[in-house]
Amino acid sequence: NFMYSKTVKRLSKLREYQQYHPSLTCVMEGKDIEDWSCCPTPWTSFQSSCYFISTGMQSWTKSQKNCSVMGADLVVINTREEQDFIIQNLKRNSSYFLGLSDPGGRRHWQWVDQTPYNENVTFWHSGEPNNLDERCAIINFRSSEEWGWNDIHCHVPQKSICKMKKIYI
């Protein structure tokens, strides 16, 4: 009976979420059949988050809106391990907006979800950031340093990376 009602609830949630994401990929977390964590298909998952690489070229603001419409934000990178996961899905000849900006041009970098900016967990290319007028951050590949961050003008269209918490049903 308990299992039946749990399944009914889960199906009802899935139906509700299908309005926003037509397909979800779910996995059972741990040994407890009660806990399913889901990401929209074809997003990828790492730890407790889902990631989507948006290949449309848009400004930083439009990229963030594109993410938020899907229930996500431009990516906030918290660890080296997270960045190492993300770059597996990126193309070396492209640049991707991060959820990191310096709106005032005073080198007060801030993450879109208000995660505190920690200088010790940043992955800027050497010599970056280097321009007060370049107020948005991208991740790109440089042959000398591999993947790292660079500051650029926010209006210049780029690809982007969206991130959201896993959906629990």
Epitope: E16, T61, S68, G71, V112, Q114, M164, I167
Partner: nanobody, 127 residues
């Protein structure tokens, strides 16, 4: 797409109360966290209050805490802002905003995280 329409603004005296409403149309309202923001002439848009999809979590700007109350009625697809003890510095255009959220306790205080915005309703406060 979600369309938002604010109402309830007007001209009042300092110390009075107002109830602002924001009606949503389009997609299922219950999947959206909601927020109120305001903008006074010559000033930047400022966060006022936010509420989670379920209504279980709310958060307020320090300047309005204890005087403003945000609430929602998912059946009526509406969010409300009850404003008490109005001050002259509360005069502004008030905007409601919506953002899809799959976490029923999450709330959002940053304007950039909202996808949909209303046209605003004017609140004028005279002393």
């Amino acid at each position: 797409q979600v369309q938002l329409q604010e109402s309830g603004g007007g001209s009042v005296q300092a110390g009075d109360s107002l109830r602002l409403s924001c009606a949503a149309s389009g997609r299922t309202f219950s999947g959206y966290a909601m927020g109120w923001f305001r903008q006074a002439p010559g000033k930047e848009r400022e966060f006022v209050a936010t509420i989670s999809t379920s209504g279980s979590s709310t958060y307020y700007a320090d300047s309005v805490k204890g005087r403003f109350t945000i609430s929602r009625d998912n059946a009526k697809k509406s969010v409300y802002l009850q404003i008490n003890s109005l001050k002259t510095e509360d005069a502004a255009v008030y905007y409601c905003a919506a953002r899809l959220s799959f976490d029923n306790t999450a709330f959002y205080t940053s304007a950039i995280r909202y996808s949909y915005w209303g046209q605003g309703t004017q609140v004028t406060v005279s002393s």
